[in-house]
């Protein structure tokens, strides 16, 4: 038998979290950021 489909509007939608560090020069230190879904938020 085929199964009846059960789903809901309450599924968890996962996004990729990407931490990155970028060297911006010898006297300026580094920028550390958190990218969520393509947008830098920190």
């Amino acid at each position: 038998d085929a199964e009846f489909r059960h789903d809901s509007g309450y599924e968890v939608h996962h996004q990729k979290l990407v931490f990155f560090a970028e060297d911006v020069g010898s006297n300026k230190g580094a920028i550390i950021g958190l990218m969520v879904g393509g947008v830098v938020i920190a």
């Epitope: 199964e3 009846f4 789903d7 809901s8 509007g9 309450y10």
Partner: antibody, heavy 123, light 112 residues
Framework: QVTLKESGPGLVKPTQTLSLTCSFS??????????VSWIRQPSGKGLEWLAH???????QYNPSLKSRLTISKDTSKNQVVLTITSVDPVDTATYYC???????????????WGQGTLLTVSS | DVVMTQTPLSLPVSLGDPASISCRAS???????????LEWYLQKPGQSPKLLIY???NRFSGVPDRFSGSGSGTDFTLKISRVEAEDVGVYFC?????????FGGGTKLELK
Amino acid sequence: QVTLKESGPGLVKPTQTLSLTCSFSGFSLSTSGMGVSWIRQPSGKGLEWLAHIYWDDDKQYNPSLKSRLTISKDTSKNQVVLTITSVDPVDTATYYCVRRASSSRYDDQFDYWGQGTLLTVSS
Amino acid sequence: DVVMTQTPLSLPVSLGDPASISCRASQSIVHSNGNTYLEWYLQKPGQSPKLLIYRVSNRFSGVPDRFSGSGSGTDFTLKISRVEAEDVGVYFCFQVTHVPLTFGGGTKLELK
């Protein structure tokens, strides 16, 4: 509040094709997790599930009736339509449309039923 | 198709007494997602069925706590701890795991 109301031709002749309409309010069939089924009940007898349509237009049918049934939805009109071909007197029954809604993940139930519409197939 | 067999067919009960209805599935109705979609409905004369219990043992909103559901796999039970006059009608079990979805034949609860 959620309401569903069925309408149909009432009396049809054998071999004809008919459409039953479920008009609903209080929810949207474009909302993830929503669905509507048609269920019928011959007078004084048991219940038989016919077909179900989901919010994303996926459909499931009772295999024994699939060749004669088509379920469709018009989200803008808040309606679900069941079309039955080649009707026979054994199709005489009260037809209910029923909402199936999700309250949480994989936690869905047929929570609201219409009042039903009586279909009589007779020559 | 999954055959749902309800017993008894008729259940005469006195007010205030307990009542129990059995529902047996011809095969397991555990869904591949791990849930068991067994529901109980009450249909009063001249009305549409109303949901009492979903997923075996969960009372639907507004359903009195005298109603309880239990079971697993293929064997399920609806119990009413103390029958009231408003409980009269036909009770149906319903499996929503396998297509086609199928109902039990119904149990008519009546007052002695």
